[in-house]
């Protein structure tokens, strides 16, 4: 089939006291081979820090997938969710706290 | 070949402000943060902020918060540092750097030497 | 601010000796926040070890790095030449991002 582009979309969930866990979820996106990562300062986190799904299939004919971090709390400017997909790429950041859900469509 | 290419180098004076370019080639220019860090002479190094080409995001050290704006052209893959109200302990060679996949700079440019002399 | 203090400032050494660098940190940074650059003069500087005991690409296997919570090394083993220069530890755990004052390898 033809590319189809992830939809992204990035949450953030209370943890800990002065933490927060922060998702990243790309979904209907093909083919299925993805690069999802978060990042600090704009280096990969290490893959200790972090938890991945599987990249799974929706239903669509399409792959949905997610990574999760914990991080402090009034530091989530400094982090950021890196996606690469089918030789494009975006950046997404942490929503502000009163602000749950972002969403991006990349083409 | 990544490389980072940066402008010239500039004399200026007292109170003046600097502007420095930074024009990395390849790799996808919006893939990676660019940092900017500075020398003066015979001293050590000092990170003055990064910039985030892809959402344009900009986080300073709080010392050059006041003076120095990162920006970015998308549409040459050019960042710059702007360096305002300038002073001769700003008298230095900075750097562009790129973040990587593991470590903060993991390629330079080869250096802006900026002279500040009344 | 997480201050990086390395010892020596100077170390002067001949060629085929060891060199052991030290850097310590003023709060403890995780191994992962730690990396090591080396700088010619006239040059800009270059990454020499990453998260504490990585060699970056194309580093040669005489450069080792270790060290934990506050307290980390950079050795090489046999020094040649082309390795007398100044040595930068970098801290990216916490901002604002911090370097050490660097330990010049100089030829004895």
């Known amino acids: 089939g033809s590319t189809v582009p992830p939809m992204v979309n990035v949450t953030r969930s209370e943890a800990s006291e002065g933490n927060i866990t922060v998702t990243c979820r790309a979904s209907s996106f093909y083919p299925r081979n993805i690069i999802l990562t978060w990042r600090q300062d704009g280096v990969s986190l290490s893959h200790d820090t972090q938890q991945w799904g599987d990249v799974l299939p929706d239903g669509n004919g399409t792959y949905q997938t997610w990574v999760a971090t914990r991080i402090c709390r009034g530091e989530e400017q400094r982090f950021t969710c890196y996606m690469e997909h089918s030789g494009n790429h975006s950046t997404h950041p942490v929503p502000s706290g009163n602000s749950h859900h972002h969403h991006h469509h990349h083409h | 070949e990544i490389q980072l290419v940066q402008s010239g180098a500039e004399v200026k004076k007292p109170g003046a402000s600097v502007k420095v370019s930074c024009k990395p080639s390849g790799y996808a220019f919006t893939s990676n943060n660019i940092y900017w860090v500075r020398q003066a002479p015979g001293q050590g190094l000092e990170w003055i902020g990064y910039i985030d080409p892809y959402i344009g995001r900009i986080i300073y050290n709080q010392q050059f918060k006041d003076r120095a704006t990162l920006t970015v052209d998308k549409s040459t893959s050019t960042a710059y540092l702007e360096l305002s109200s300038l002073r001769s302990e700003d008298t230095a060679v900075y750097y562009c750097?790129?973040?990587?996949?593991?470590?903060?700079?993991?390629?330079w440019g080869q250096g802006t030497l900026v002279t500040v002399s009344s | 601010e997480i201050v990086l203090t390395q010892s020596p400032a100077t170390l002067s050494l001949s060629p085929g000796e060891r060199a052991t660098l030290s850097c310590s940190a003023s709060s403890s940074i995780s191994s992962n926040y730690l990396h090591w650059y080396q700088q010619k003069p006239g040059q800009a500087p270059r990454l020499l070890i990453y998260?504490?005991?990585n060699l970056a690409s194309g580093i040669p296997a005489r450069f080792s790095g270790s060290g934990s919570g506050t307290d980390f090394t950079l050795t090489i083993s046999s020094l040649e030449p082309e390795d007398f220069a100044v040595y930068y530890c970098q801290q990216g755990g916490s901002l604002p991002l911090t370097f050490g004052q660097g330990t010049k390898v100089e030829i004895k």
């Open positions: 750097s790129r973040s990587g996949e593991r470590s903060n700079f993991d390629y």
């Open positions: 998260r504490t005991s």
